[in-house]
């Protein structure tokens, strides 16, 4: 039987890779219940001082960051990738994730989103990394695979509760986040609402119920009156910059 542990996340693009090797191992808590966390060799860690956050893909970074090699050129070819600050409008880009929230990459330049920049019926190719996290599965089914997913993006924006593929599918003030085993449009977090701050690779856990990121002008920070609490129970909320 499966135990229950509660966790929420504001990492909203795609579910980040869960902890390596946690599935089915002795001593690892695999939980499948509302708001799930399972733990492998990595413990949750909270750092208040900024450190470069290693990543394998954009989804592992915050909403105002993207994953790339710190040096110019091909991202991550033979080198470590880290989360880098997003690029503001009119800056050069190679993909949407490089541009800051409210912008998208068009012709190599970050442009402001107008909520209808995908013409009706335009096909967007997105690569989803399937990391084969097959808990209790037969051996040999756990190798990484890449799947090319083709989908149509329409003008109509999803309302709260609508299923989505990415945040651009959702109406203003909503993001695309995991809910149970699916993805739906959820509200972007307001000031004072609880958020989850991921600062290190391996600290994501398996998040069945993700929260959105904090809204514009807000950052996910430790709540002041929780500074004395133990590392594992520090509460993060959306606060003014």
């Amino acid at each position: 039987t499966l135990n229950s542990v509660l966790i929420n996340s504001n990492a909203i693009k795609n579910l980040p890779p869960p902890l390596g090797g946690a599935g089915g191992q002795p001593g690892s808590a695999v939980s499948v219940a509302p708001g799930v966390l399972y733990e492998g060799g990595n413990k949750y860690q909270t750092l208040d001082n900024y450190q470069p956050y290693p990543c394998a893909e954009d989804e592992e970074c915050g909403s105002d960051e993207y994953c790339s090699s710190p040096s110019r050129g091909a991202a991550g070819v033979g080198g470590v990738q880290i989360c880098l600050a997003c690029r503001k409008r009119r800056k050069r880009c190679m993909r949407h994730a490089m541009c800051c929230p409210g912008n998208y990459c068009k012709n190599g330049i970050c442009m402001p989103s107008d909520h209808s920049h995908f013409p009706r019926g335009e096909i967007e190719e997105s690569i989803i990394e399937n990391l084969g996290n097959d808990h209790n599965a037969a051996a040999g089914d756990g190798y990484p695979r890449r799947t090319t997913l083709t989908s149509k993006i329409y003008h109509t924006k999803g309302q709260e509760g609508s299923v989505c593929l990415r945040s651009s599918d959702c109406a203003a003030g909503l993001c695309c986040a995991r809910h149970f085993w699916s993805k739906i449009c959820k509200p972007v977090l307001k000031e004072g609402q609880v958020c989850t701050k991921h600062k290190r690779k391996g600290s994501h856990g398996l998040e069945i119920f993700q929260r959105c990121y904090c809204g514009e002008g807000l950052a996910c920070r430790i709540q002041k009156d929780h500074h004395q609490a133990s590392n594992s129970s520090r509460l993060h909320t959306c606060q003014r910059h």
């Epitope: 499966l2 229950s4 795609n14 579910l15 890779p17 869960p18 499948v32 219940a33 509302p34 708001g35 989803i128 399937n130 990391l131 084969g132 996290n133 097959d134 808990h135 599965a137 695979r145 799947t147 997913l149 989908s151 299923v163 989505c164 593929l165 995991r178 809910h179 149970f180 085993w181 699916s182 993805k183 739906i184 398996l206 119920f209």
Partner: antibody, heavy 117, light 112 residues
Framework: QVQLVESGGGVVQPGRSLRLSCAAS????????MHWVRQAPGKGLGWVAV????????YYADSVKGRFTISRDNSKNTLYLQMNSLRAEDTAVYYC??????????WGQGTTVTVSS | DIVMTQSPLSLSVTPGQPASISCKSS???????????LYWYLQKPGQPPQLLIY???NRFSGVPDRFSGSGSGTDFTLKISRVEAEDVGVYYC?????????FGQGTKVEIK
């Protein structure tokens, strides 16, 4: 309109394998988690397995753990259930079911698996 | 696992009369999103289960208004205000707040 069509069932001997498929249409398959549920003859409903929208997370009922593998191909809008080391007690009608079961008929018509020597 | 307990397990009803089925869960089905993940299905002979009620009280499209669901937390009820011949079959409650999804044992409804 939302449709889930299961196939691949049949009569098989104990210890052998079978692969079920569920073809989905009428909804954004790649946004939804998918489940397999089964029903033994004259019995109630039992959950078998789930796979997340992107295939990264999978969970199984204790009774099928290590024998069954759930997978999906989002480019083909298809869900699979690979069933190995089949036992007599796996005899059932197998249904694929969509996660978030509030917005459309979330189950297929079912495919029958009979494990018998 | 969450245990779902239905009662009664069988019900014989005169057409036009009301019927009521109870479902109890071993833990609360109320989620932090405010929704309660409790469903009612009807399985007619030789057919797959069909959704009647989702999230306790919402009727699925095309379901007659004689069907209604109520309850909260761990106690739920399906009511049929006036049973008709076509309502025969086995009624199941189901929870989806966590996997494994679990079902009640089923309530067989027949016409007197």
């Amino acid at each position: 309109q939302v449709q889930l069509v299961e196939s691949g069932g049949g009569v098989v001997q104990p210890g052998r394998s079978l692969r079920l498929s569920c073809a989905a249409s009428g909804f954004t398959f790649s946004s939804y988690g998918m489940h397999w549920v089964r029903q033994a003859p004259g019995k109630g409903l039992g959950w078998v397995a789930v796979i997340s929208y992107d295939g990264s997370d999978k969970y199984y009922a204790d009774s099928v753990k290590g024998r069954f593998t759930i997978s999906r191909d989002n480019s083909k809008n298809t869900l699979y259930l690979q069933m190995n080391s089949l036992r007599a007690e796996d005899t059932a009608v197998y249904y694929c079911a969509r996660d978030l079961v509030d917005t459309a008929m979330p189950w297929g018509q079912g495919t029958t698996v009979t494990v018998s020597s | 696992d969450i245990v779902m307990t239905q009662s009664p397990l069988s019900l014989s009803v005169t057409p036009g009369q009301p019927a009521s089925i109870s479902c109890k869960s071993s833990q609360s089905l109320l989620h932090s999103d405010g929704k309660t993940y409790l469903y009612w299905y009807l399985q007619k002979p030789g057919q797959p289960p069909q959704l009647l009620i989702y999230e306790v009280s919402n009727r699925f499209s095309g379901v007659p208004d004689r069907f209604s669901g109520s309850g909260s937390g761990t106690d739920f009820t399906l009511k049929i205000s006036r049973v008709e011949a076509e309502d025969v079959g086995v009624y199941y409650c189901m929870q989806s707040i966590q996997v494994p999804w679990t079902f009640g044992q089923g309530t067989k409804v027949e016409i007197k």
